[in-house]
């Protein structure tokens, strides 16, 4: 054996080294990697040192027997059967109240012939529960509402008005309050006939002046 090189590096079970035929001189770096389903135990990078010894002990390739942490899901809690997620472990996701689960609630860590163990599914999502709209209120008798829709989304406001000669009793505007279920902030108002005195006192008399006869007017008629 030469005395100016590091010792020959062997192949390792269930893995390989690169380069496969390294020069064994000082400064040479050799990297060990494992086949799918195995992971490096020890240092994967070895370097030929000044004193012609390798910087680290030879690593080994160990079978991967667990899944990676599938992670937390926003707006949820999770129940874990085994903290290191070995094959057979389960993770159950439960959405916080007001959120709806999209995907699988329970994931199971499964072994695979080739490659590392894998979760039965990807982590789910917890989406905000859709707030139900408020049902449209009918316009008060002798009045109107705007907008005139059958369903009003949570947060929307509707406005009420009364026909001439009627006054509004109640709230002129009411809101669809978001909730489970969504609900109107107030009962719908009513339109009450104004007293005749009040009706006349509240109005001034406008006299409209008729336009002078003109050829334009004649033409229009």
């Amino acid at each position: 054996p030469r005395n100016d090189t590091c010792p020959e590096l062997p192949e390792i079970p269930n893995g390989w080294k690169s380069p496969s035929q390294p020069e064994l001189v000082h400064g040479t770096v050799v990297t060990y990697q494992c086949y799918p389903g195995y992971q490096v135990v020890g240092s994967s990078v070895l370097m030929c040192q000044w004193d012609l010894t390798w910087s680290e002990d030879l690593p080994s390739c160990q079978r991967v027997t667990s899944c990676h942490d599938p992670g937390d899901v926003e707006h949820s809690r999770r129940l874990i059967s085994s903290p290191k997620f070995p094959v057979g472990a389960t993770v159950q996701y439960i959405c916080d109240q007001g959120f709806v689960l999209m995907g699988s609630s329970i994931l199971t860590c499964h072994d695979r012939q080739a490659g590392s163990p894998k979760w039965s599914d990807r982590a789910p999502k917890c989406l905000l529960e859709q707030l139900k709209p408020c049902h449209g209120l009918s316009a008060p008798e002798n009045g109107a509402r705007s907008p005139e829709k059958q369903l009003h989304p949570a947060g929307a406001t509707i406005h009420f008005s009364c026909a001439p000669g009627y006054v509004l009793k109640g709230q002129a505007s009411i809101k669809c309050v978001p909730g489970h279920p969504s609900h109107w902030s107030d009962p719908p108002p009513i339109c009450r006939a104004a007293s005749l005195d009040g009706f006349y006192n509240s109005r001034s008399l406008d006299v409209a002046k008729a336009p002078a006869a003109s050829s334009t007017l004649d033409a229009a008629h």
């Epitope: 949820s76 129940l79 059967s81 439960i94 916080d96 109240q97 007001g98 329970i106 489970h180």
Partner: antibody, heavy 120, light 106 residues
Framework: EVQLQQSGPELMKPGASVKMSCKAS????????MHWVKQNQGKSLEWIGE????????GYNQKFKGKATLTVDKFSSTAFIELRSLTSEDSAIYYC?????????????WGAGTTVTVSS | QIVLTQSPAIMSASPGEKVTMTCSAS?????MHWYQQKSGTSPKRWIY???KLASGVPARFSGSGSGTSYSLTISSMEAEDAATYYC?????????FGSGTKLEIK
């Protein structure tokens, strides 16, 4: 009738561990998650964590991680809570309580509670 | 975590009187649940999903609210209603409880 029967009171020394039990009857044990709630003397309630009796899966309030361990014995329909490294702060009533079926956000049946007193 | 503040902390009411207690959340929640606890006993589920009465709860009880403001109302106080009432949310993990309203009979 659905019942949760809890073990008797415990008088413990600081630094010790205690394990309490909660035996369920009157329903299918594996259909409902079991929760544990702490109530300090004359104070409010704190959720410790829960366990799914079917999978053994557990979830904890961050505050009680490392303090409490939840387990179940499916065959005897019993849930357990173990508290370690006890201090006077752990003196309280501990309730086991059942989560709602397919409705995981409230507690529908409660045990009578186990009183734990930590004193030297 | 969401903090639930109950008010008043202590209140008293005469038989037949209307009683309202409130639970205010530090962040918006979707639903609120309420528990009744009498001295020396464990809590009982009383109102769930904001307004649904648990089995056996008298119809004089009602619950309402949305967002950060919820309330429990007794339309006509009776002696057996004297207890401490706790609100609870799970719109965010961990679930949290209010500090309780102690209701006494005058």
């Amino acid at each position: 009738e659905v019942q949760l029967q809890q073990s008797g009171p415990e008088l413990m020394k600081p630094g010790a561990s205690v394990k309490m039990s909660c035996k369920a009857s009157g329903y299918t044990f594996t259909d409902y998650n079991m929760h544990w709630v702490k109530q300090n003397q004359g104070k409010s309630l704190e959720w410790i964590g829960e366990i799914n009796p079917n999978t053994g899966g557990t979830g904890y309030n961050q505050k009680f991680k490392g303090k409490a361990t939840l387990t179940v014995d499916k065959f005897s329909s019993t849930a357990f809570i173990e508290l370690r490294s006890l201090t006077s702060e752990d003196s309280a009533i501990y309730y086991c309580t059942r989560g709602g079926y397919d409705h995981y956000w409230y507690f529908d049946v409660w045990g009578a509670g186990t009183t734990v007193t930590v004193s030297s | 975590q969401i903090v639930l503040t109950q008010s008043p902390a202590i209140m008293s009411a005469s038989p037949g009187e209307k009683v309202t207690m409130t639970c205010s959340a530090s962040s918006s929640v979707s639903y609120m649940h309420w528990y009744q606890q009498k001295s020396g006993t464990s809590p009982k589920r009383w109102i769930y999903d904001t307004s649904k009465l648990a089995s056996g709860v008298p119809a004089r009880f009602s619950g309402s609210g949305s967002g950060t403001s919820y309330s429990l109302t007794i339309s006509s106080m009776e002696a057996e209603d004297a207890a401490t009432y706790y609100c609870q949310q799970w719109s965010s993990t961990p679930p949290t409880f209010g500090s309780g309203t102690k209701l006494e009979i005058k």
